[in-house]
Amino acid sequence: TGADTEAVVCVGTACYTAHSGKLSAAEAQNHCNQNGGNLATVKSKEEAQHVQRVLAQLLRREAALTARMSKFWIGLQREKGKCLDPSLPLKGFSWVGGGEDTPYSNWHKELRNSCISKRCVSLLLDLSQPLLPSRLPKWSEGPCGSPGSPGSNIEGFVCKFSFKGMCRPLALGGPGQVTYTTPFQTTSSSLEAVPFASAANVACGEGDKDETQSHYFLCKEKAPDVFDWGSSGPLCVSPKYGCNFNNGGCHQDCFEGGDGSFLCGCRPGFRLLDDLVTCASRNPCSSSPCRGGATCVLGPHGKNYTCRCPQGYQLDSSQLDCVDVDECQDSPCAQECVNTPGGFRCECWVGYEPGGPGEGACQDVDECALGRSPCAQGCTNTDGSFHCSCEEGYVLAGEDGTQCQDVDECVGPGGPLCDSLCFNTQGSFHCGCLPGWVLAPNGVSCTMGPVSLGPPSGPPDEEDKGEKEGSTVPRAATASPTRGPEGTPKATPTTSRPSLSSDAPITSAPLKMLAPSGSPGVWREPSIHHATAASGPQEPAGGDSSVATQNNDGTDGQK
């Protein structure tokens, strides 16, 4: 696996294992995971001390670490795309096994500001210094490594395995050897707490094979939150030693009989448990049997106890632990109910806001109210929503249907509306004629007029071309359809007399761009259409975004 020497420390309800091996963070997490754990958390100073202890144990065994400053992966990571967050203790990092953003941290230095790369945390150990409880390993952040390239100075990793509970180590009343095999496949002969479901092999005797006896025990849950080996009396007892060997294996007092036999006993205020070795307080609350914020309440005469939960919580089936009451089961809200630890909160659907009669009531948001309308032009409020409408000459546009876009009547589905030239304007259009022709009174047809070499007649006058009130223009486009950007003279469209076979557009207009600019301008010249043109006219590139502009690659101009 690439992970070699290991050390183990068990305390509370967790075991920590330290491994040497140059692995990436993902490989290290996979190694921990295969045995039912995760890369270790360091959520408090106490936990940091446990982790330091297991690393010290590893370093005593491991002489060949190559770097003076060695790093060991822990389970603190920041996913790709999640930015460093300086306002949080964990700086936007989170524990691989889940869990809340804990207040404890011990960063080595200011963190690198990044978002794109996945980042992982290792414990930084200066191997030239002794490991002292007052000098806990610092957290170092960096790339997570990859197979064959774990990252600079990575020497190993620390795993954490959590359990329902622990058994006390087996007590030997005479010479012998205990070997514990944990659920995470570690063997050890010296654990200060032994995790639930571990096996213990006891070989009694002083190494003389003829006198050796073997015993096998399993750490089981005897009662809720009570873990026990199921053995009774000290193991490997020998009349030769009596109480003189390891206090006879007794937890507190050892009493010898005249024949070399002995018994375990307890001090005042304590009682001997079923294993005939261990002593427990007579006050049942002294062992803190209640969990999860539950308070232990002594029963009459101090004989038994009950657990009591704070408001918003109730006892679970074990009667020892508090679980959140789901107040949302009673439907206390008008719309959405969100259960929270110890309480709940009401929320409203999109388009509604808190208000109205009663607790948790919701009322319709008037999206069309003055100052908050999302619509470019017309807005109609509906229950829980709204819809937009546009004035004549405009159609709804935009991803969310809130914008209004000018209808280019010059390229409408029915073909050009003018006999000759057509000038689209915001919300309307005008017809015009080629040189030598004049616009008929109907505003559409052209009649022969006096010969002129001037520009085509009919571009809209300044006063004619005004936008409709409330209209919008394409994003980042100028609002003037016939005037170029500042400092650009108004151009005259080039024209040629169209023929029936003509495939070319009658006019071409340049794309004008302010680059780079605060409000890039797009300038459109009028489209020119002729009743006899065989193919539809093309809109110049960079035109009003209401028109699908024909591009050289044959795609339309819209994304």
Partner: antibody, heavy 120, light 108 residues
Framework: QVQLQQSGAEVKKPGSSVKVSCKAS????????MHWVRQTPVYGLEWMGG????????AYNQNFKGRVTITADKSTSTAYMELSSLRSEDTAVYYC?????????????WGQGTTVTVSS | EIVMTQSPATLSVSPGERATLSCRAS???????LHWYQQKSGASPRLWIY???NLAFGIPARFSGSGSGTEYTLTISSLQSEDFAAYYC?????????FGGGTKVEIK
Amino acid sequence: QVQLQQSGAEVKKPGSSVKVSCKASGYTFTDYEMHWVRQTPVYGLEWMGGIDPETGDTAYNQNFKGRVTITADKSTSTAYMELSSLRSEDTAVYYCTNYGNLYYYAMDYWGQGTTVTVSS
Amino acid sequence: EIVMTQSPATLSVSPGERATLSCRASSSVSSSYLHWYQQKSGASPRLWIYSTSNLAFGIPARFSGSGSGTEYTLTISSLQSEDFAAYYCQQYSGYPLTFGGGTKVEIK
């Protein structure tokens, strides 16, 4: 002080590719991510993607459908943005930008911009 | 992706007057990840306000930013001649980063 110097304007044919460079100075190149934003008249400012020069990891805007490739050369402190299968609507000003010592993708430093014109 | 909608597209204001620019997100955005940029004609955008309400270095105190969730605002208490420019909002809550379409503040 931080400076981002971009390559000069380009005129390209539809279907071709363009590669714009951005040379960084005034800071350690691998300390900050480098991002690319373009500006067109119709679509305004669009984030194209970014790179972490320390690791070479990248993030892209999927709207560009794999046409964008961002790379970084640590030896020359230069980032590159290549856009392929050019079309007329790729005519834009292209900026390299980074957020320096600020957090949460607040783009503090910008190059001067490179105008790319796509025309047949 | 989150769509940022700025309104109005153009704001005509006289010098000395107050200007309020709006930026609306299609989904909720963390206030830490909402920024504003100023851009003048022919220049690159410049960071103006970061994390909703923090003025970038050298930005005058007449500018302020506020908002949360989907609604954000940039306010100029008393417009000066140098404030006439385009302003863009930008968000990040997962890729892609997106910008608003901009509000052009012009002299009335």
